[in-house]
Interface confidence: low
Amino acid sequence: RLSWYDPDFQARLTRSNSKCQGQLEVYLKDGWHMVCSQSWGRSSKQWEDPSQASKVCQRLNCGVPLSLGPFLVTYTPQSSIICYGQLGSFSNCSHSRNDMCHSLGLTCLEPQKTTPPTTRPPPTTTPEPTAPPRLQLVAQSGGQHCAGVVEFYSGSLGGTISYEAQDKTQDLENFLCNNLQCGSFLKHLPETEAGRAQDPGEPREHQPLPIQWKIQNSSCTSLEHCFRKIKPQKSGRVLALLCSGFQPKVQSRLVGGSSICEGTVEVRQGAQWAALCDSSSARSSLRWEEVCREQQCGSVNSYRVLDAGDPTSRGLFCPHQKLSQCHELWERNSYCKKVFVTCQDPNP
């Protein structure tokens, strides 16, 4: 009977800039799952006695638990679960509809640092010195999953990867995204976007690491051959990636049609719904095929751009061809041309 008291139980805290606080995710037989705060018969707004999660904090090499309850803003990953039975039991869980799930947050005390650490501790359990080399993507607070600054850890050494814009490294980026279980490489992030603009008041855990790596072999097929250690650079870029598995994705819906398979396209990304404005980068039907798929409809029958004679018509704009590639939406404040899409209805 799996519970968070078991020695082989695996958990991590995500969506924060610390391994000791965030949204609780657990590893069950088929991968990582976000735990809904409605689990174990609780209400989604109920706060628990945090001491019940002390084993989770211990396992993450953090201090005592400070709070256990709903996480502030939920970014629902692909898989979220509601569990039943005793608090902390994971032997009877079911997949939850993402829009019904409020994530469970846990905050543990940051570990006491007696001496400055040589590396940032890993996000879950601390590896043994013989642990294989591994990667970590560090997003800014509240930032995206599968987007951020790449850190490479080898044995007890860890740090960022120095990157020159002229480096021809497309194969490497694909390999890294793949290794991180984040799909394929989409684009490089500027450091501010990846969250590395350091604030002097930030905790030491998020100050730059004392080790830095340089790309040694951009065609490498195992991590130990990709990078070599260098003296940390005071200036220069570090490698920061956006991978195709980033979350939260833009969601779409069709409104104002005669069925769920036709209508004006609306989108959202963590906020409320707004009209999607037509974009010159999406003149092909690829974008609309994707929208139709998301509605669980058939392929695109037709799409037409509605006239934007109204200078006050507003909406959101995605500069990429597909919405799934759009890691952020821009606001269009006037002349937003809405798009009416008709998909094949699987249940006419």
């Epitope: 969506r15 803003v73 607070s141 509240g142 500027p190 976007e193 963590g270 952020e328 821009w330």
Partner: nanobody, 112 residues
Framework: QVQLVESGGGLVQPGESLRLSCVVS????????WGWYRQAPGKQRELVAQ???????DYADSVKGRFTISRDNAKRTVYLQMNSLKFEDTAVYYC??????WGQGTQVTVSS
């Protein structure tokens, strides 16, 4: 629930400066683009400036060269530095991200 609190408005003379701040509660701050908007009496609300997560900015023609938008992710704050203020900048100023409901705003009055 995301809360937005705008501040920094006031009464100034033409040519003077103001700095508006908007503090955001909620983890949504870091990964979303932010905008400053304004609404003058009897007019439509308009987008004044916006900034995306990468720090790229965009301004309404009427404020280009005079207003600067910036953000501080650590403080979860978005700023609007307004220089060389004109009478026509008088309005209630709001900060927001696409699709969110509006806060209270902060009044800016330019008068001699």
């Amino acid at each position: 629930q995301v809360q937005l609190v705008e501040s920094g408005g006031g009464l100034v003379q033409p040519g003077e400066s103001l700095r508006l701040s908007c503090v955001v509660s909620g983890d949504i701050f870091s990964f979303i683009g932010w905008g400053w908007y304004r609404q003058a009496p009897g007019k439509q609300r308009e987008l004044v400036a916006q900034i995306n997560t990468g720090g790229l900015t965009d301004y309404a023609d009427s404020v280009k060269g005079r207003f600067t938008i910036s953000r501080d992710n650590a403080k979860r704050t978005v700023y609007l530095q307004m220089n060389s203020l004109k009478f026509e900048d008088t309005a209630v100023y709001y900060c927001n991200f696409p699709g969110h409901s509006w806060g209270q705003g902060t009044q800016v009055t330019v008068s001699s």
